[in-house]
Each structure stands twice: as structure tokens, then as C-alpha cells.
Amino acid sequence: MMTGTIETTGNISAEKGGSIILQCHLSSTTAQVTQVNWEQQDQLLAICNADLGWHISPSFKDRVAPGPGLGLTLQSLTVNDTGEYFCIYHTYPDGTYTGRIFLEVLESSVAEHGARFQIP
């Protein structure tokens, strides 16, 4: 039975040219996390594997950095980075848990940094 829940940084905004941290946190389950995938729409950005560590998709290598933790840092943001991002937790034996983050990249310097709530 899947009892876990994923908390995410929710809807966030950042300034063009800047960077942002995408974070998810899985709680309320005893399941063991074996892999976390980060995706943007249908594109795989990165994988954090419990055994093999991080793998960043070649097309994002210059602008994506692993961490902190199981999170992902997006750098050199462009307006085209606006959209939905998903963290997909593969857990044993529960299955997959998916969290959603919406990022808006703003031209203006008044972009609001940070999250709706903090991840532990």
C-alpha cells in the first residue's frame, strides 16, 4: 500500500540568467528509494541512482547540477525553461511517487526567489 507523500517547492519563479533549486521530499513511508528521476515534460533531465550516483542528460550537462541532496539545480535560466518539472521517486516496494513543480522564469529583476514552503 502506498502511504508516502511528496512535498515539493510548489510554484516558484526565478530571474532569467539566474539559477534555481528544484527539491522534493518523500515522507510517510518506510519504502526504500532506489532511484529519483527528474523530468521536464517528457524530457529526462537527470537521474540520481542509489548505487550509481548521478547521471545528467547530455543535452542538459552545461546547465544542470546535481543536488543539494536529491534535488536539482538549474543554472543560466532562460524564459524557455518556464514549465512543469517532475521528480519521480522509484521506491521498494511501494512503487513510484511523483511530485510536480511549476517554474516561471521572468525577464524582470523582481522575480520571487524561493519556495512556497521549505523542504526539511
Partner: antibody, heavy 122, light 107 residues
Framework: EVQLVQSGSDLKKPGASVRVSCKAS????????MNWVRQAPGHGLEWMGW????????TYVQGFTGRFVFSLDTSVNTAYLQISSLKAEDTAVYFC???????????????WGQGTMVTVSS | DIQLTQSPTFLSASVGDRVTITCRAS??????LAWYQQNPGKAPKLLIY???TLQSGVPSRFSGSGSGTEFTLTISSLQPEDFVTYYC?????????FGQGTKVEIK
């Protein structure tokens, strides 16, 4: 070489306790969940449950609660199964088995210990 | 709980035969099924995972197929060492039960 090596066969009297060990080598112990499987003589395989090798949190399948305890010593890459108040019906081979595969659609028990025969007899 | 039923329970065949073992699930389990081979007095050995993916080092005469509720393990040409017991296991929802086993015997 990835392997799981279990402790040797054990003969116990009813009411006694037994501890079966499962020593892992050749891989990162805390990256893969560990399972315990029972096989009574002449019978099939029964999944007893598993232990989270990151947190040490055990989960027991119905029928294996109470007298059965899964534990870990990550400093020596070893998982343990302890059975207390042994009964004749606990006589079986006990296997530890690693959950391989990293994504939910590829999980399977990819590495097994050789098995430990526990005989309960007065 | 999801139950798995293997058929047949016993199978008599000869070296070189093509044999098929079926595993039926009591509800849909997608492709979350594994097949194991067990020699007497030995630990099970993983043959197939994700219904059809051959585990590294397993001979290509073994293959798996199916999805949903019906799955098959096929041995294209039985070898002397294949006359042992085979189990299916689902990995879709707790608890991860095994089938009752199929013993392949020499005719």
C-alpha cells in the same frame, strides 16, 4: 563478485531462538533492499518481508509478525533474521535475497544467499 | 493480495523439447513479474525480470512474455540442467507473492 553468504545450518529445540546471518559483499550494502524468503521442506517460496538497508526499518508480511525480527549491522554489511519461541513448523530453509533493479518496473530478487536450514525438533 | 497460479505443476519433457510454463495473476500486474529457477537444495536463481528481460548471464534459450494477468516462461530447447523447478513472482503491490512452482521432469 556480488554475493550473499549465510550462516550455517542450525538445530534447535522448540521454544528456543535462532539467528541467521547474511553477509553481503561486492556491492554497496545500503543501496539495495534486503528480503527474507522461507522454504519449508518440499514446499514453495514464501516472501517473509524485507528490511530497508538505509534506515534499518523492517516490514513483515502477514504471518511473519511477532516472533520474527529483521535487523542490520551496516558496519559489517550484514542482515540478520532472528526467530524466537521456535516451533516445529518453523523448520525450513531461510534465504536472504537482494532486491536488484533501480526502477519500479525492474525490481527482482537478483542475488540470493545459499540458504540456511533451521531444524526445530525436540 | 495478488495470487499467482502456475500451470502445469508438473511437466514431463525430453532434452531438446520446447516447453512453456504459464503464470496467471489474480489481477492486473502490468509487467512486474520475475521468473526463477531452483535446483534441489540450492538457492533460486533469477532468470527473467520485468516479464521479458533476460537477466545477465542467463542462456538465451530462456525467454519470457506476457503482461497484465497472463505470463509465460519458454525454454526453446531443454538441456539436461533445465530439469528443475521454476517459480514466478509478482512485484506489483505488497506482498510480493510467488507462484506455487512448476517442476520440469525428464520424460
Amino acid at each position: 563478485e556480488v554475493q550473499l553468504v549465510q550462516s550455517g545450518s542450525d538445530l534447535k529445540k522448540p521454544g528456543a531462538s535462532v539467528r541467521v546471518s547474511c553477509k553481503a559483499s561486492g556491492y554497496t550494502f545500503t543501496s539495495y533492499p534486503m528480503n527474507w524468503v522461507r522454504q519449508a521442506p518440499g514446499h514453495g517460496l514464501e516472501w517473509m518481508g524485507w528490511i530497508n538497508t538505509n534506515t534499518g526499518n523492517p516490514t513483515y508480511v502477514q504471518g511473519f509478525t511477532g516472533r520474527f525480527v529483521f535487523s542490520l549491522d551496516t558496519s559489517v554489511n550484514t542482515a540478520y533474521l532472528q526467530i524466537s519461541s521456535l516451533k516445529a513448523e518453523d523448520t525450513a530453509v531461510y534465504f536472504c535475497a537482494r532486491t536488484g533493479g533501480h526502477t519500479y518496473d525492474s525490481y527482482a530478487f537478483d542475488v540470493w544467499g545459499q540458504g540456511t536450514m533451521v531444524t526445530v525438533s525436540s | 493480495d495478488i495470487q499467482l497460479t502456475q500451470s502445469p505443476t508438473f511437466l514431463s519433457a525430453s532434452v531438446g523439447d520446447r516447453v512453456t510454463i504459464t503464470c496467471r495473476a489474480s489481477q492486473v500486474i502490468s509487467s512486474s513479474l520475475a521468473w526463477y529457477q531452483q535446483n534441489p537444495g540450492k538457492a533460486p536463481k533469477l532468470l527473467i525480470y520485468a516479464a521479458s528481460t533476460l537477466q545477465s548471464g542467463v542462456p538465451s534459450r530462456f525467454s519470457g512474455s506476457g503482461s497484465g494477468t497472463e505470463f509465460t516462461l519458454t525454454i526453446s530447447s531443454l538441456q539436461p540442467e533445465d530439469f528443475v523447478t521454476y517459480y514466478c513472482q509478482h512485484l506489483h503491490g505488497y506482498p510480493y507473492n510467488f507462484g506455487q512452482g512448476t517442476k520440469v521432469e525428464i520424460k
